[in-house]
């Protein structure tokens, strides 16, 4: 028997520095977690103690903090090289800055193979990008070899900006021939490493003949055997065992997100490459693990540029941006409109001639808007200003919901109206009319939504049984502010871009902004 230790991360999302327990900015260092310096300490400790170790990343290193905003992926290549990752799969967020924003900072600079078997380049891009990422790589580990085959969510064109010259094929269809190719090379220990979410990970384990282990990402899935060490609730045991169609037991793993945990899986193979046993658990990277001094020093050196960036002008406003709780928790506020417009703008994807865009709607809890921005400071808007408006380090995500769920959400928005509570919704691509004289749960008297399957966008009444795409904060997707119906009834959830980054990009693009209060939210006469 031969034993392999797989160390794995996924959905790190730009958390190069240590974070608080909820993966936001570290405030009290003695209680902070994660970060590449701490990760390196643990990785090195395991590398010294165990003979056959692979360090793998399942994608979405890009996007999530000011580190990515400023360094645009160069930080990912630099620190992943420093940690000596063995391989990485491409995630959807690796395409957030377009193909060029992937090629130059990461693909050309990484000293480790970057993998995806189901992304095929066509047209002029084919010769430019070919070879910069690989479908698979065979890695020597001790006296053995291990094949790693990569995959990426086929939803990427709807979630990011890969352009029109990359085709995202079905994962299973694309993986099988590459695994077969590895088999012809007599590679009998094969790991599928990818970024399509836990459900697809399980399907790959079930359907792709020859895959021995699946290391996944995208769904931020936390798996754990025993008592979990922090706040995350396990979605299942670690590893999660799937019985393949040909009768093999295939371990599937994921390690939550944001570099908070290091996935740790030990696999025992027989001489024919069959998995005999698998066990392990994610390791919580808490403050009991010291940060590596040399990596930490490097982080501090790279940090300097971030501090300078946060005070630079992104654009100007010529109107007061009303982000006060007195406005945003009671009525339509222009800061809410600005943020929602930025959220929709960030999700413009012309992927189908029938649709002007795949999504037109935004909802945003008023309680998530934490500060106004005064235009009387020469109109200047900085990252620092936006960090005061959106201080929680969240993301603006894409969900699919039935009309009936949206109706419940809007009823919840005003179920206890008047108490300055955070659940009052700001909107984009939606016209809502409330009658507060009616009883809670029956106050939405009109709810019109902007069409997507149209050449001239117009507002149509919400249909209860129709499925709609909506952009919203991850806080709401996870049921925050009492929006349990969203969490319970959502049909799909894909995590998106960092909230501040979305708004800052929009402001930089527009240069001068003047959002108005324009009748998106109305109250029927006599009730307000």
């Amino acid at each position: 028997a031969w034993e392999l230790t797989i160390l794995h991360t996924n959905d790190v999302h730009s958390r190069l520095e240590q974070t608080s327990e909820d993966s936001s900015k570290c405030v009290n260092a003695s209680r902070c977690m994660g970060g590449v310096a701490r990760l390196f300490t643990k990785v090195q400790q395991i590398r010294r103690a165990e003979p056959n170790v692979l360090l793998l990343d399942a994608g979405d290193q890009y996007q999530g903090t000011i580190w990515f905003t400023v360094y645009k992926g160069a930080e990912v290549a630099h620190f992943m090289n420093a940690l000596r990752y063995d391989a990485m799969a491409l995630g959807n967020h690796e395409f957030d800055n377009g193909v060029e924003g992937l090629i130059e900072p990461l693909l050309k600079e990484a000293k480790f193979p970057i993998l995806s078997a189901n992304i095929k380049a066509k047209g002029p891009l084919a010769s430019q990008i070919s070879g910069l990422y690989l479908p698979y790589k065979v890695l020597p580990v001790g006296d053995e070899v291990v094949g790693i085959v990569g995959y990426t969510s086929k939803e990427t064109p709807f979630l990011s900006n890969p352009g029109t010259n990359l085709v995202f094929e079905d994962e299973i269809t694309a993986l099988q021939p590459e695994v077969d190719k590895l088999k012809t090379l007599n590679v009998n220990k094969i790991i599928a490493l990818g970024h399509s979410g836990f459900e697809m990970d399980k399907l790959i384990a079930q359907k792709v003949r020859g895959v021995d282990v699946v290391v996944g990402g995208h769904s931020n899935t936390f798996l754990y055997t025993g008592n979990p060490p922090s706040k995350e609730v396990p979605a299942g045991k670690y590893p999660f065992i799937v019985t393949s169609d040909d009768g093999r037991k295939v371990p599937v793993v994921q390690a939550y997100a944001f570099g908070k945990y290091l996935g740790y899986l030990k696999i025992e193979f027989d001489e024919r490459g069959n998995v005999i046993s698998s066990h392990g658990n994610p390791i919580l990277l808490n403050s009991s693990i010291p940060e590596d001094p040399s990596i930490k020093a490097d982080i501090n050196k790279w940090r300097i540029k971030l501090d300078n960036y946060s005070t630079q002008e992104l654009g100007k406003t010529i109107v007061y941006l009303d982000g006060s709780s007195q406005s945003c928790r009671f009525r339509e506020c222009n800061m809410g409109n600005l943020i929602c417009d930025a959220m929709i703008n960030n999700n413009l994807r012309h992927t189908d001639e029938m649709f002007w865009n795949h999504v037109s709607m935004c909802i945003l809890n008023g309680g998530g808007i934490r500060s106004p921005i005064d235009e009387r400071n020469n109109g200047t808007i900085t990252w620092e200003n936006l960090a005061a408006v959106l201080p929680f380090g969240g993301t603006f995500d894409l969900v699919q919901l039935k009309g009936s769920t949206l109706k419940k959400a809007f009823e919840h928005s005003v179920h206890r109206y008047g108490q300055s509570t955070g659940e009052f919704l700001q909107v984009g691509g939606i016209h809502v009319v409330y009658d507060l004289s009616r009883k809670p749960g029956d106050r939405v008297v009109k709810l019109d939504v902007l069409c997507t399957k149209c050449r001239v966008p117009s507002y149509d009444p919400l249909k209860m049984d129709e499925v709609y795409k909506v952009i919203l904060p991850n806080f709401l997707a996870n049921g925050g502010d009492g929006f349990q119906m969203i969490k319970d009834e959502l049909l799909r959830h894909d995590s998106g871009d960092q909230d501040i980054n979305v708004v800052s990009t929009y402001i930089s693009k527009m240069k001068v902004i003047y959002p108005a209060v324009e009748g998106r939210i109305k109250f029927s006469t006599g009730s307000h």
Epitope: G131, L134, Y136, P140
Partner: antibody, heavy 117, light 107 residues
Framework: EVQLVQSGAEVKKPGESLKISCKAS????????INWVRQMPGKGLEWMGR????????NYAGKFKDQVTISADKSISTAYLQWSSLKASDTAMYYC??????????WGQGTLVTVSS | DIQMTQSPSSLSASVGDRVTITCRAS??????LNWYQQKPGKAPKLLIY???RLHSGVPSRFSGSGSGTDFTFTISSLQPEDIATYYC?????????FGQGTKVEIK
């Protein structure tokens, strides 16, 4: 450091047999393919065949199929190329090269075989 | 068998020049195309695999591109130590096959 060290030059007569060797070190010999490549004087490279030492699996190019035998002894990390009856046209430089996935990453220094009466 | 055709068969260029060699496969080989350098009296060395990936330790002045049947190998600024014969090789299908080689000389 990966190294492939080949046996020394050979001068043989037509009809004689010959076995040349390629000893590997610094990597997982048993788990990667050893390829043999011929280069006739003043000519280009020709792939002859390959062996997977752990299982003994072999593949040959059509023109070399019944002309040579490729074998390996994984206990001493050595691959072999042999002829049972040499011809003058077998005069060439022979290289071994290891292949893990896409390409022949590492090459031996070559063994010059001269067949002359 | 897949035929690999390289052009030109030889070229002469000055130090600092950009040098381009092309390789055409008789059928689609996806990106399974490698480039090797062979200096006089020496064994071949891998430069580029899977169309454009630089093998470890290979200078960045060497690059590759292409897809399907047409591939290009470039030396961005020719150095005296680059005098050699360069071979393309397809790894898509057995038997593995090489181009006939391109001899690069200094003017």
């Amino acid at each position: 450091e990966v190294q492939l060290v080949q046996s020394g030059a050979e001068v043989k007569k037509p009809g004689e047999s010959l076995k040349i060797s390629c000893k590997a070190s610094g990597y997982a010999f048993s788990s990667s393919w050893i390829n043999w490549v011929r280069q006739m004087p003043g000519k280009g490279l020709e792939w002859m065949g390959r062996i997977y030492p752990r299982a003994g699996d072999t593949n040959y190019a059509g023109k070399f199929k019944d002309q040579v035998t490729i074998s390996a002894d994984k206990s001493i990390s050595t691959a072999y190329l042999q002829w049972s009856s040499l011809k003058a046209s077998d005069t060439a430089m022979y290289y071994c090269a290891s292949l893990l996935d896409y390409s022949m990453d590492y090459w031996g220094q070559g063994t010059l075989v001269t067949v002359s009466s | 068998d897949i035929q690999m055709t390289q052009s030109p068969s030889s070229l002469s260029a000055s130090v600092g020049d950009r040098v381009t060699i092309t390789c055409r496969a008789s059928q689609d080989i996806s990106n399974y195309l490698n480039w090797y350098q062979q200096k006089p009296g020496k064994a071949p060395k891998l430069l580029i695999y899977y169309t454009s990936r630089l093998h470890s330790g290979v200078p960045s002045r060497f690059s590759g591109s292409g897809s399907g049947t047409d591939f290009t190998f470039t030396i961005s600024s020719l150095q005296p130590e680059d005098i050699a014969t360069y071979y393309c090789q397809q790894g898509n299908t057995l038997p593995l096959t090489f181009g006939q080689g391109t001899k690069v000389e200094i003017k």
